[in-house]
């Protein structure tokens, strides 16, 4: 028989106190936190890495600082006014040698359009990216490299969450080796050649992401070469054979009943704790229907709620979630129709998502008014829309061209919506910023390293 | 991938009693929790009864509430709902389903028709 093979990355996620007030509750913050390793994990499983398969993610541990950690002197995210570098260096600044790598998530709004940073992994002589050891390093101070950060916030809005997964797989792809894609082979989105274009970037694309295009949740070429050699000498010094779930983490995992934490944690009075004995812990105490743990359909009472109690706001393009009385889960919303305006006016809803462009409405495509096309540099934050495979077409919302549909209404893009073929966002004044792919990892590599081991990290 | 399969329906008279089996193949149970839905005809799927498969913790409907017992036994991946006082309203054909985690009751079997006569 063949020995299981050591394809699992354990992770330990934080999330600050802003993180916290965005998403209101401990349950919808491991909502988020599941959600977001769930996806990275999809795209890891399904990738081949040159013969290496099945590459999945496990959190081993969470910590949630919630409001009532903004003035605990011990948390070290509780700062307000923090810049991304110096927000990875605190979380670096602890010891993270039990896990294969540790995240923090939170709702900053970074300058330049940064969602994220990480350490960048390398086969050999890496200070940086999966596995590393906490060490002391050059500027004195001990530190563990197998960190990253993500925001959900950029120019003042919430980025969508397929947005906000391909950050986290793509600050993740830092720590497994892969550096930012480039050359035509690995940056198709910038290919004038219209078929090619149209599929997008891949993850490691250096700037921005809409997350809608077929590449977007792929790894390219590139990508898959420098992290299956991260991958062939780094795995064996930290992964783990997948199987048990981890009771105490906080989230239900398959085999387990529920999860509130460990004793320490555990406000629950449903769910028998991490620290119980084998056949009990992540078990339902006896007579008990659920556990908060499950879902927000069960009550702190450990009952089920009742029909029609509001489980999930309604959205743009989903009705409100409705608990069912047998189940702690939120069962599906229903869509709202599709072509329903969405995201102010900017987008559609198709299938319950708001995922299309409001030029859809009006059978055209969504195009860029880019300046390389010799437009204003004005309209590079419009919704520009043109004639499905025609370029020479594209046009703002608020041009002539398509004013039977518009009206001659401007329709502009939400603050923080990819801009300029991707090259940027739209900030708060609907001018697009470009994004400065490496400045923050640079500033920090000459903040803690010697000279020689500048290479080492990424947003 | 987990089948499920209903048996053990039939005719039988009000006041009877009858129990349903649910046998589960393919990759053992680690669900949650199991469940046995109800459709008579005309009328949307309903909820009857669940239970945890770990800790046998069991949930029943209203409707059914001390004329219904839902169990199961491990060793044969098997789940069972004895149901006795039948009454003609709980004609219908009996489905079970499981959930896992994050999806609620994703999985169903084929159903298995019961009919209660006056």
């Known amino acids: 028989t063949t020995s299981a093979e050591k394809n699992t990355c354990q992770l330990y996620i934080q999330t600050d106190h802003l993180f916290f007030k965005y998403y209101g509750t401990r349950e919808a913050v491991i909502a988020q936190i599941s959600s977001h390793v769930k996806a990275i994990d999809t795209i890891y499983q399904t990738t081949d890495f040159s013969g290496i398969r099945n590459i999945s993610f496990m959190v081993k541990r969470i910590r949630i600082n919630t409001t009532a950690d903004e003035k605990d002197p011990t948390n070290p995210f509780r700062f307000p006014n923090i810049g991304v570098e110096k927000f990875l260096e605190l979380n670096s600044e602890q010891n993270h040698d039990d896990y294969c790598l540790a995240y923090v998530f939170t709702d900053r709004d970074f300058d330049d359009g940064v969602l994220g940073l990480a350490w960048v992994g390398a086969p050999s002589g890496s200070s940086g990216g999966i596995c590393e050891k906490s060490k002391l390093y050059s500027d004195g101070k001990k530190k563990s490299l197998n960190t990253g950060i993500i925001t959900v916030q950029n120019y003042g809005s919430h980025v969508p969450p397929k947005v906000s997964h391909i950050t986290f797989a793509h600050e993740v792809g830092h720590n497994f080796g892969s550096p930012h894609d480039s050359g035509t082979e690995c940056t198709p989105g910038e290919s004038k050649n219209l078929g090619q274009k149209e599929n997008g970037n891949y993850i490691m694309y250096a700037r921005a992401t809409s997350g809608d295009k077929l590449n977007n949740n792929k790894f390219s070429l590139c990508s898959i070469r420098n992290i299956s050699q991260v991958l062939e000498k780094k795995r064996n010094n930290c992964f783990v054979e997948s199987g048990q779930p981890i009771c105490g983490n906080g989230m239900v995992e398959q085999g387990e009943e529920c999860d509130c934490g460990y004793s320490d944690q555990c406000k629950d009075e449903c769910c028998f704790d991490a620290n119980q004995p084998e056949g009990r812990k992540c078990k339902l105490k006896p007579g008990k229907q659920c556990s908060p743990s499950q879902g927000p359909c069960c009550t702190a009472q450990c009952a089920f709620k009742s029909k029609s109690e509001k489980c999930r706001d309604d959205s743009d393009c989903a009705r409100e979630g409705i608990c069912n009385g047998f189940t702690a889960l939120c069962p599906a919303s229903d869509p709202k129709p599709n072509f329903t305006d969405c995201n102010r006016h900017t987008q559609v809803c198709i299938n319950g998502q708001c995922a299309g462009s409001i030029c859809e409405k009006y059978g055209l495509e969504e195009c860029t008014c880019a300046s390389s096309d010799g437009k204003d540099d004005k309209e590079l934050c419009h919704v520009c829309c043109m004639k499905k495979m025609d370029p020479s077409t594209c046009a703002s919302t608020g041009s002539v061209q398509w004013s039977r549909h518009f009206s001659g209404r401007t329709i502009t893009l939400q603050p923080g919506s990819p801009c300029n073929d991707f090259r940027g966002y739209c900030d708060v004044f609907m001018r697009c910023r470009l994004v400065d792919a490496d400045g923050p990892l640079a500033r920090l590599k000459k903040a803690i390293f010697s000279p020689e081991l500048y290479e080492n990290i990424a947003e | 991938e987990v089948q499920l399969v209903e048996s053990g329906g039939g005719l039988v008279q009000a006041g009877g009693s009858l129990t349903l089996s649910c046998a589960a193949s393919?990759?053992?149970?680690?669900?949650?929790?199991l469940g046995w839905f109800r459709q008579a005809p005309g009328n949307e799927r309903e909820f009857v009864a669940s239970i945890t498969w770990s800790s046998a913790n069991t949930y029943y409907a209203d409707s059914v509430k001390g004329r219904f017992t839902i169990s199961r036994e491990r060793a044969k991946n098997t789940m069972y709902l004895q149901m006795d006082s039948l009454r003609p309203e709980d004609t219908a054909v009996y489905y079970c389903?499981?959930?896992?985690?994050?999806?609620?009751?994703?999985?169903w079997g084929q159903g298995t028709q019961v009919t209660v006569s006056s």
């Open positions: 389903a499981k959930e896992d985690v994050g999806k609620p009751f994703d999985s």
């Open positions: 393919g990759r053992t149970f680690s669900s949650y929790r």
